[in-house]
């Protein structure tokens, strides 16, 4: 056959669906690779063809659209499973072509099994709720397009294994789950199961997401430098190792980039000639506030190094702060044996 623009295997779109549930999968060509949509392509006389390669096989084969009850069907640029089976797992290809044009892309589809508590190998989206922030909602995700607006589905919400009912601060409201006041105890996996009828059959859509309760913007502050501070002086003799920790607390801020860096005499360590190393460690609180520690280390400090200015800087979306470390050269201790002996008139 003639040349075809092959976009390869789009592993960015690792699609995971539950066994025995409907799945609607849009051809990624129109979403990520081509500058026109399906309607335009169809009007221009292009045909969308689907085929697949089973798991652990190399052979591309056409998709069987003549299964009982139309279990697999195509509608415009969507491939439908009503429902999926475990052995539908494989790489699926959609190809758009006519006599003069051809473009195709493949993507992996994994049909996964869940246990009785909705645990599975499915990668879960994370939804962050602000702690004690007032009413916040999560919405049952990725259920659009499965049934018409005239169909009224039933939605059951679970936290872990248990139906959400009589919870103090969590209320199911159809497709939404409302948190009246989010607390750390609300951390966990939440599952909505949408049940709807279609052509005399009942279908279920299971969607699980992880809720993480994080620090509220109401409580957010600019970065706080705990160290260096005015109470600690780094006194060293030449030849000793100089270690100065810069420890900074960052309030949780959605999509904020937290930065910590040192300057030595106003320059970044990379821009000066002395042999300095920086080691960073990061820890998080239960509400995802962040503590970053950067330890500045000079293995064998010189008297010149001890005269330099060492400043720790920190920046977040809330602001920028800086703090200088107090560094000085240790005054040599008196050599007591000699001096005291002289004092007593020893010859």
């Amino acid at each position: 056959s003639e040349r075809c623009d092959d976009w390869g295997l789009d592993t960015m779109r690792q699609i995971q669906v539950f066994e025995d549930e409907p799945a609607r999968i849009k051809c990624p060509l129109f979403e990520h690779f081509l500058k026109f949509n399906y309607s335009t392509a169809h009007s221009a006389g292009l045909t969308l063809i689907w085929y697949w390669t089973r798991q652990d096989r190399d052979l591309e084969e056409p998709i069987n659209f003549r299964l009982p009850e139309n279990r697999i069907s195509k509608e415009k640029d969507v491939l439908w499973f009503r429902p999926t089976l475990l052995n539908d797992t494989g790489n699926y290809t959609c190809m758009l072509r006519n006599t003069t044009y051809c473009s195709k892309v493949a993507f992996p589809l994994e049909v996964v099994q869940k246990d009785s508590c909705f645990n599975s190998p499915m990668k879960l989206p994370v939804h962050k709720l602000y702690i004690e922030y007032g009413i916040q909602r999560i919405t049952c995700p990725n259920v659009d397009g499965y049934f018409p607006s005239s169909v009224k589905p039933t939605i059951t919400w679970y936290m872990g294994c248990y139906k959400i009912q009589n919870f103090n601060n969590v209320i199911p409201e159809g497709m939404n789950l409302s948190f009246l006041i989010a607390l750390i105890s609300n951390n966990g996996n939440y599952t909505c199961v949408v049940t709807y009828p279609e052509n005399g059959r009942t279908f279920h859509l299971t969607r699980t997401l992880t809720v993480k309760v994080v620090g509220s913007p109401k409580n957010a502050v600019p970065p706080v430098i705990h160290s260096p501070n005015d109470h600690v002086v780094y006194e060293k003799e030449p030849g000793e190792e100089l270690l100065i920790p810069c420890t900074v607390y960052f309030s949780f801020l959605m999509d904020s980039r937290n930065e910590v860096w040192w300057t030595i005499d106003g320059k970044k360590p990379d821009d000066i000639t002395i042999d300095v190393t920086i080691n960073e460690s990061i820890s998080h609180s239960r509400t995802e506030d962040e503590t970053r520690t950067q330890i500045l280390s000079i293995k064998k400090v010189t008297s010149e190094d001890l005269k330099r200015s060492y400043v720790c800087h920190a920046r977040s979306a809330k602001g920028e702060v800086a703090k200088a470390a107090k560094v000085k050269q240790k005054v040599p201790a008196p050599r007591y044996t000699v001096e005291l002996a002289c004092g007593f008139g020893a010859t």
Epitope: D20, Q113, S116, T156, V193, T202, H204
Partner: antibody, heavy 117, light 107 residues
Framework: QVQLVQSGAEVKKPGSSVKVSCKAS????????MNWVRQAPGQGLEWMGR????????HYAQKFQGRVTLTADKSTSTAYMELSSLRSEDTAVYYC??????????WGQGTLVTVSS | DIQMTQSPSSLSASVGDRVTITCSAS??????LNWYQQKPGKAPKLLIH???GLHAGVPSRFSGSGSGTDYTLTISSLQPEDVATYYC?????????FGGGTKVEIK
Amino acid sequence: QVQLVQSGAEVKKPGSSVKVSCKASGYAFTSSWMNWVRQAPGQGLEWMGRIYPGDGNTHYAQKFQGRVTLTADKSTSTAYMELSSLRSEDTAVYYCGEGYLDPMDYWGQGTLVTVSS
Amino acid sequence: DIQMTQSPSSLSASVGDRVTITCSASQGINNYLNWYQQKPGKAPKLLIHYTSGLHAGVPSRFSGSGSGTDYTLTISSLQPEDVATYYCQQYSILPWTFGGGTKVEIK
């Protein structure tokens, strides 16, 4: 379409055990709950317990705890209900009922178990 | 265990009549209520789940409503094929429990 086919009628002596099977087809056996419900002659429905064949998780009604055992064979898509220490009041029709969640969407045809000396 | 009380235990109505069956729970069940239909000598069939969700293939003359502890099954226009016993069942808290049943007959 979903089908649950149960084993045939049984006549048992008091003190013995009975094992009723329920063969499932037309859906993913490991992804739904299999419930067991009984109905004594002329009486209402009584839930006994359920099993999730995917991971073997079971829940039993307190009344039957220790006397009923629910199992599932994934290779044959068959669920089993074994009731031991039978007495005359266990005479009933025993149903299996499949539910993706908690409602029992589809039921087997029922198995009559008669306990008589 | 949650007790489910159905009323009436039996009723007789004419074809085309509106029929109402009620079910009362011994505590709130948060709409986690199903209705089943059982015809003589047959297995039960799910009619309605989660108080008001019509199961696939069930005629629209069947409807459910209620909240808290009190729930209702309504047949808007009784048909000869609706002769059966109807059971409510809670699935709020294990063990699942059924009402005693309501036998519906044609006058």
